[in-house]
């Protein structure tokens, strides 16, 4: 399977997950595929603590996360429940804005310059963050 006991080179370990931060931009789907080929997924933010960690690393730059509503309801790419989970939207977001003139609404979520979330056109070339969880078994203390 895909279990890991330590983070790959150039990834950052934090709270039993590994994170990789791009330095360039891709459309949301291309960023998603990049992460999947690396046995990871676009970052799923489950707490305020994780939000602050990611925000610290990305700085004030629009950055894709693993949250979208391309098929209707908002969904996290790893199956984490959206409705009951952590959220950090900007005021009046998400708004599925159609006024950008690019066709359709806004179906992909990103961190904005202040870290809060916005929905935007999935084709925009934003930076992205991949995340992969470390082997859950390795959290158990060794048997004596």
């Amino acid at each position: 399977g895909s279990e890991r006991t330590c983070c790959p080179v150039n990834w950052v370990e934090h709270e039993r997950s590994c994170y990789w931060f791009s330095r360039s931009g891709k459309a949301w789907a291309d960023a998603d595929n990049y992460c999947r080929l690396e046995d990871a997924h676009l970052v799923v933010v489950t707490s305020w603590e994780e939000q602050k960690f990611v925000q610290h690393h990305i700085g004030p730059v629009n950055t894709w996360m693993g949250l979208h509503d391309q098929n209707g309801p908002w969904k996290w790419v790893d199956g984490t429940d959206y409705e009951t989970g952590f959220k950090n939207w900007r005021p009046e977001q998400p708004d599925d804005w159609y006024g950008h003139g690019l066709g359709g609404g806004e179906d992909c979520a990103h961190f904005t310059d202040d870290g809060r979330w916005n929905d935007d056109v999935c084709q925009r070339p934003y930076r992205w963050v991949c995340e992969t969880e470390l082997d859950k078994a390795s959290q158990e203390p060794p048997l004596l």
């Epitope: 895909s2 459309a27 595929n33 080929l37």
Partner: antibody, heavy 121, light 107 residues
């Protein structure tokens, strides 16, 4: 450094099946994404499929989707391409390549020497 | 799918010549472009990735440039071992696609 060597090519009738193998040397195989690229005789290169290091995530060109299956056995350091419902247009040299991650994207390096698949009656 | 085109399809040159090959993508691919060299009967070899980064072990006479849709591979002083076919490839999005190739022949 990973080195790769393909095998399993040969002559097969249209509608038939074939499984290609790619043996890799190098201690990082289980964490390396891998890919298949093909080249029809006298033609250019065509990406076929890719797979993540664990084998959990796979990607296919539309031309082979539903007919070809990429897989890997990390305990044997081996990559596979199961080819079903073969057509004349699948005739090509099939190359195995490591997917090299750098500068926020993926590149093919190194490549194997290729194995020839001929689909003909 | 992103279509890749190359020009010229073939070029005749002499040892010591400067050779330039161009590659164009049907839509913007930022700097996600690679160049490969293939000799007859051999596997392709990665020369340049991320549009301008020279792969380890590749001679410095090879260089790449460009961004967006237009890219260039330059061989500053052609050597006998450089006669081959050169392919560009976009690594921006699936399906990864290659250009049709440019054959560099001896004049």
């Amino acid at each position: 450094e990973v080195q790769v060597l393909e095998s399993g090519g040969g002559l097969v009738q249209p509608g038939g099946s074939l499984r290609l193998s790619c043996a890799a040397s190098g201690s990082t195989f289980s964490s390396d994404a891998m890919s298949w690229v093909r080249q029809a005789p006298g033609k250019g290169l065509e990406w076929v499929s890719a797979i993540s290091g664990s084998g959990d995530n796979t990607f296919y060109a539309d031309s082979v989707k539903g007919r070809f299956t990429i897989s890997r056995d990390n305990s044997k350091n081996t990559l596979y391409l199961q080819m079903n419902s073969l057509r004349a247009e699948d005739t090509a040299v099939y190359y195995c390549a490591k997917v090299y991650s750098a500068y926020d994207s993926h590149w093919f390096d190194p490549w194997g020497q290729g194995t020839l698949v001929t689909v003909s009656s | 799918d992103i279509q890749m085109t190359q020009s010229p399809s073939s070029v005749s040159a002499s040892v010591g010549d400067r050779v330039t090959i161009t590659c164009r993508a049907s839509q913007g691919i930022s700097s996600w472009l690679a160049w490969y060299q293939q000799k007859p009967g051999k596997a392709p070899k990665l020369l340049i990735y991320a549009a301008s980064s020279l792969q380890s072990g590749v001679p410095s006479r090879f260089s790449g440039s460009g961004s967006g849709t237009d890219f260039t591979l330059t061989i500053s002083s052609l050597q006998p071992e450089d006669f081959a076919t050169y392919y560009c490839q976009q690594a921006n999005s699936f399906p990864w696609t290659f250009g049709p190739g440019t054959k560099v022949e001896i004049k």
